[in-house]
């Protein structure tokens, strides 16, 4: 039975040209995390494999940095980066947990972080 929950940075906003950290945290389970995938829509941005470390998709190498921790840093943001991001935790023996983050990239300098929220 899957008992874990994923806490994410929730709905967030950032300025065009700036950077943002996408963070998820898996709690309430003793399952072993084998890999975390970061996806935007259906595109894979990065993989953090427990054994092998980080893989950044070649098309995002210039603008995506691994970490901190299992999180992901997006740099040189553009308005096109607005949208949904997913952290997908592959765990043993529970299976897969998915967290969702919505990022809005703003033209102005009034970007504010949204509240944290949980996805069971």
């Amino acid at each position: 039975m899957m008992t874990g929950t994923i806490e994410t940075t929730g709905n967030i906003s950032a300025e065009k040209g700036g950077s943002i950290i996408l963070q998820c945290h898996l709690s309430s389970t003793t399952a072993q995390v084998t890999q975390v995938n970061w996806e935007q829509q259906d595109q894979l941005l990065a993989i953090c494999n427990a054994d092998l470390g980080w893989h950044i998709s070649p098309s995002f190498k210039d603008r995506v940095a691994p970490g901190p921790g299992l999180g992901l840093t997006l740099q040189s943001l553009t308005v096109n980066d607005t949208g949904e991001y997913f952290c997908i935790y592959h765990t043993y023996p529970d299976g897969t947990y998915t967290g969702r983050i919505f990022l809005e990239v703003l033209e102005s300098s009034v970007a504010e972080h949204g509240a944290r929220f949980q996805i069971p």
């Epitope: 084998t34 890999q35 995938n37 996806e39 259906d42 595109q43 894979l44 993989i47 494999n49 054994d51 092998l52 470390g53 893989h55 070649p58 592959h90 897969t96």
Partner: antibody, heavy 122, light 107 residues
Amino acid sequence: QVQLVQSGAEVKKPGASVKVSCKASGYTFLSYYMNWVRQAPGQGLEWMGIIDPSGGRTSYAQKFQGRVTMTRDTSTSTVYMELSSLRSEDTAVYYCARARYPSSWPYGTDVWGQGTTVTVSS
Amino acid sequence: DIQMTQSPSSLSASVGDRVTITCRASQSINSYLNWYQQKPGKAPKLLIYAASSLQSGVPSRFSGSGSGTDFTLTISSLQPEDFATYYCQQSLLTPFTFGGGTKVEIK
């Protein structure tokens, strides 16, 4: 040219260990992950594990956990795969295979060794 | 572990035929799917990586498509040297499992 040359055929008794080598040449050894894949007679391909020659990090298929050890010698650009507690079902051709993309793993394996036949028989 | 199911397990075709081999993953693997060709007594050869990218030196009659869980390898016009066994492999999540193979034989 890019090449992987493996050690010669081995005949082992059940319970013994075997260590297969794979010497790389023609590219930057530290930049490419190395996979090990085996193929039993008349059967399909079976992924065993992978090693990062740069840091020595490894990931093994659960099936081989505790029996397989992958190592590397950076001075000779050689990776090794040791399989212990051999049984007859381990009779197979063992291949080393280089990851296609530098410093990463998800894009297949573009260069393969010639294969090493390991026969386990009493 | 992710299970990879190939179909058919074997097929008979003639030179010039269009051949399609399918591979299904037990869960989404995005586009992290590779195709290999193997001839008897030889090491496998990479044909397609990342579901649809043609490996350097591979003839353009080979093509790959699909994403998520369903993938296809197509040989547009089968040549005599294409009679071999073909394997799919997912490389998203360790262990990087292979499909059972599809043997393409001469009709």
